[in-house]
């Protein structure tokens, strides 16, 4: 056979569909690989051919389009299953060709089973709702093209295993599910079951998504530096280890790049001739607000290091802040205080200087 532009196995489109439900799968060539659409290709005399490789087999075989009730069919650039069976799992290839041109791509299709509570190995899309933000909606996804607009399907919504009816703040509205006001308690998996008739048969489409309630933009603030702060003095003797944590709170902001960094005398720590290490840790609240901590560490600090300026900087889409740490060299108790103490017949040992918080 003549050469064919082979786009290989398109693993980015790990298509998962439920067993015993309709599935319509568009040939990825026109969506992601070629610069023209199916109509243009068809007008130019190109033919779209489908074949597949069963799971755990190497043999490519044609797709049987002569099954009872047209269980598998092709329409333009779409491969239809009405409905799927478990053993439809495999790698599917669509090839566009004529006598002078050929291009093909394969993609994996996995038919998965679900239990009565809609639990399955299906990867679930995540929809973020803002906490206490007013009315927000989610829409039953990936149901376009399954039935004509003249058909009026029935849609039933579930949270987890439970049908949504008489919920306080969640109202089914056909293809939409409205949250009058979202709370943390609304976190969870939501399923819509779309039931529609076709040629005397009844089909069901099951779509599950995860709702995650996150911080609201109306409550979002610029980064807040909790440490260093004005109440803590980092007082060290030369030779001791200096540890300064920079702890920053970031409000949840969609697609914000949250940054924390230290400067020493206005420069990057690595540009200063001292052995500095920085360890970062990140934690998230239930609403995905973020706390980042960067601990600046100098194993054996010198008197020169104790004169430097250590500034923690933080930045998000909401703004930028900076805070200097108060670093001092510990002053040894003067000799005369010891002599005075002896002179007055004191029995206790002399104490060092006191600080608000000592690190």
């Amino acid at each position: 056979s003549e050469r064919c532009d082979d786009w290989g196995l398109d693993t980015m489109r790990q298509i998962q569909v439920f067993e015993d439900e309709p599935a319509r799968i568009k040939c990825p060539l026109f969506e992601h690989f070629l610069k023209f659409n199916y109509s243009t290709a068809h007008s130019a005399g190109l033919t779209l051919i489908w074949y597949w490789t069963r799971q755990d087999r190497d043999l490519e075989e044609p797709i049987n389009f002569r099954l009872p009730e047209n269980r598998i069919s092709k329409e333009k650039d779409v491969l239809w299953f009405r409905p799927t069976l478990l053993n439809d799992t495999g790698n599917y290839t669509c090839m566009l060709r004529n006598t002078t041109y050929c291009s093909k791509v394969a993609f994996p299709l996995e038919v998965v089973q679900k239990d009565s509570c809609f639990n399955s190995p299906m990867k679930l899309p995540v929809h973020k709702l803002y906490i206490e933000y007013g009315i927000q909606r989610i829409t039953c996804p990936n149901v376009d093209g399954y039935f004509p607009s003249s058909v009026k399907p029935t849609i039933t919504w579930y949270m987890g295993c439970y049908k949504i009816q008489n919920f306080n703040n969640v109202i089914p509205e056909g293809m939409n599910l409205s949250f009058l006001i979202a709370f943390i308690s609304n976190n969870g998996n939501y399923t819509c079951v779309v039931t529609y008739p076709e040629n005397g048969r009844t089909f069901h489409l099951t779509r599950t998504l995860t709702v995650k309630v996150v911080g609201s933009p109306k409550n979002a603030v610029p980064p807040v530096i909790h440490s260093p702060n004005d109440h803590v003095v980092y007082e060290k003797e030369p030779g001791e280890e200096l540890l300064i944590p920079c702890t920053v709170y970031f409000s949840f902001l969609m697609d914000s790049r949250n940054e924390v960094w230290w400067t020493i005398d206005g420069k990057k720590p690595d540009d200063i001739p001292i052995d500095v290490t920085i360890n970062e840790s990140i934690s998230h609240s239930r609403t995905e607000d973020e706390t980042r901590t960067q601990i600046l560490s100098i194993k054996k600090v010198t008197s020169e290091d104790l004169k430097r300026s250590y500034v923690c900087h933080a930045r998000s889409a909401k703004g930028e802040v900076a805070k200097a740490a108060t670093v001092k060299q510990k002053v040894p108790a003067p000799r005369y205080t010891v002599e005075l103490a002896c002179g007055f017949g004191a029995t206790g040992s002399g104490s060092g200087s006191h600080h608000h918080h000592h690190h």
Epitope: D255, R257, N258, E259, W261, K268, P269, D270, V276, T277, I278, N279, E280, S281, I282, H313, R315, A317, E320
Partner: antibody, heavy 119, light 107 residues
């Protein structure tokens, strides 16, 4: 002396995969965010992806989202770019670069590795 | 995404000339603007960060200015080794974006 050394480039067919590596030395690797930037033959610079020092946050250009994955192994001082579903337009020299923070820019770059996507 | 527009796209100059390259951002980027120099077959090199701060080891004939949307890179007295392509880049938000480049050629 800061050094960044990319490897893993080469010729790959459309739809294929490649994994680029960037070996870092001369600085405290885990302190720094790292980026991949590419340059198609005769064209300008295009940022591809970035990862924070801890590896906890990743960022991608829309043109590679869902196809490329950036990661790092701080114990090996190595940055990676896993490239799947490669297209002809991904043909470029790929550079890794280090960044203390966005304020300081991409202050050191590797010499680049060429990725050619062609059938 | 923030678009970065450089001008001119190329210029011819002589050794000793004062050269100015401008860069405009499609929205305010504060001072998150960096300048890079790239020579054929080589990796880019950071010259200026934060709009006006000179990167360590870069000659003082290079300077940067501007904030918000309009920025300038100036080479006070062009040297033979300065003939190269110069790129501006915003690091205000991801995706990081570069200008299309300005090629400085020998007159």
């Amino acid at each position: 002396e800061v050094q960044l050394l990319e490897s893993g480039g080469g010729l790959v067919q459309p739809g294929g995969s490649l994994r680029l590596s960037c070996a870092a030395s001369g600085f405290t690797f885990s302190n720094y965010a790292m980026s991949w930037v590419r340059q198609a033959p005769g064209k300008g610079l295009e940022w591809v992806s970035a990862i924070s020092g801890s590896g906890g946050s990743t960022y991608y250009a829309d043109s590679v989202k869902g196809r490329f994955t950036i990661s790092r192994d701080n114990s090996k001082n190595t940055l990676y770019l896993q490239m799947n579903s490669l297209r002809a337009e991904d043909t470029a020299v790929y550079y890794c670069a280090k960044e203390w923070s966005s304020y300081f820019g991409l202050d050191y770059w590797g010499q680049g590795t060429l990725v050619t996507v062609s059938s | 995404d923030i678009q970065m527009t450089q001008s001119p796209s190329s210029l011819s100059a002589s050794v000793g000339d004062r050269v100015t390259i401008t860069c405009r951002a499609s929205q305010s980027i504060s001072s998150y603007l960096n300048w890079y120099q790239q020579k054929p077959g080589k990796a880019p090199k950071l010259l200026i960060y934060a709009a006006s701060s000179l990167q360590s080891g870069v000659p003082s004939r290079f300077s940067g200015s501007g904030s918000g949307t309009d920025f300038t890179l100036t080479i006070s007295s062009l040297q033979p080794e300065d003939f190269a392509t110069y790129y501006c880049q915003q690091s205000y938000s991801t995706p990081l974006t570069f200008g299309q480049g300005t090629k400085v050629e020998i007159k």
